[in-house]
């Protein structure tokens, strides 16, 4: 297993609709054809897997149908979008990239993007 540098923004504020997008960029040392991207969430010292996708270079990322993540790839960049976020989902979202094929296997883990989520203010009741 060889180490690889992964860069991602430090802080991002999700939209009022609970959507957060950020780029995860990895310094690929070779010509990988198969890449796996995993998003981990760290909050209160616990780390959980948010979503993961394996893709072939040049193809779209395919997450599971019920995943809250979508993404696109371009060269050594992966543009990740996480939706359905609420204030309680605020936390550090870490991008993990694995170059699966061809060997050697490379692993890179970013420093994380602190995603802040603000629940929208409830609309005041109005009489019609």
């Amino acid at each position: 297993c060889k180490a690889m540098h992964v860069a991602q923004p430090a802080v991002v504020l999700a939209s009022s609709r609970g959507i957060a997008s950020f780029v995860c960029e990895y310094a690929s040392p070779g010509k990988a054809t198969e890449v796996r991207v995993t998003v981990l969430r760290q909050a209160d010292s616990q780390v959980t897997e948010v979503c993961a996708a394996t893709y072939m270079m040049g193809n779209e990322l395919t997450f599971l149908d019920d995943s809250i993540c979508t993404g696109t790839s371009s060269g050594n960049q992966v543009n990740l979008t996480i939706q359905g976020l609420r204030a309680m989902d605020t936390g550090l979202y870490i991008c993990k990239v694995e170059l699966m094929y061809p060997p050697p296997y490379y692993l890179g883990i970013g420093n994380g993007t602190q995603i802040y989520v603000i629940d929208p203010e409830p609309c005041p009741d109005s009489d019609f």
Epitope: P9, A10, V11, V12, L13, A43, D44, S45, A87, T90
Partner: antibody
Framework: QVQLVQSGAEVKKPGASVKVSCKAS????????ISWVRQAPGQGLEWMGW????????NYVQKFQGRVTMTTDTSTSTAYMELRSLRSDDTAVYFC??????????WGQGTLVTVSS | EIVLTQSPGTLSLSPGERATLSCRAS???????LAWYQQKPGQAPRLLIY???SRATGIPDRFSGSGSGTDFTLTISRLEPEDFAVYYC?????????FGPGTKVDIK
Amino acid sequence: QVQLVQSGAEVKKPGASVKVSCKASGYTFTSYGISWVRQAPGQGLEWMGWISAYNGNTNYVQKFQGRVTMTTDTSTSTAYMELRSLRSDDTAVYFCARLSRAGHDYWGQGTLVTVSS
Amino acid sequence: EIVLTQSPGTLSLSPGERATLSCRASQSVSSNYLAWYQQKPGQAPRLLIYGASSRATGIPDRFSGSGSGTDFTLTISRLEPEDFAVYYCQQYGSSPFTFGPGTKVDIK
């Protein structure tokens, strides 16, 4: 090295608007947020809100909602805070601060805004 | 909104003494995202501690932070003349990011 340099002192009349700038250097501007914090004479620190330089999304304290606008110009790595309908109790030093994973790790030198008729 | 309460309001000590400052939150601070800042007259605040216990870059090791949940402490092991200032805690785990009212450490 990381630096945040703010615009100079302003004197405004009640009801007017003020726009304070905060020019960042020494880091990737879009990777962080910019918060605005104010301090009235002899008082403590009051957080006003922040803007995500990555996507331009903003989060304002309810007290300032509708009266404040925070923006960024990524081409010049500059953040702006505009406060409208100024009152005498808005007289304060306004600070910008970089929001990172470690909280507000770098601060501007402050801009004194005086509201007086 | 998380309300932060700092105590004491003023701490009168001599150089070389130990200072213990308290910050209490009205509810648990998410991921212990609690920071401590030092501010001297006419200057911008300076980050001392983040994540409740991590020292910021360039901060001397006489400054230490501890605590979790709702109770946090800043300790200055041996006060130096340049440490006499106002100290603020701030939570940045959930919006709005609130500050405590501050503790003034002055010379006895």
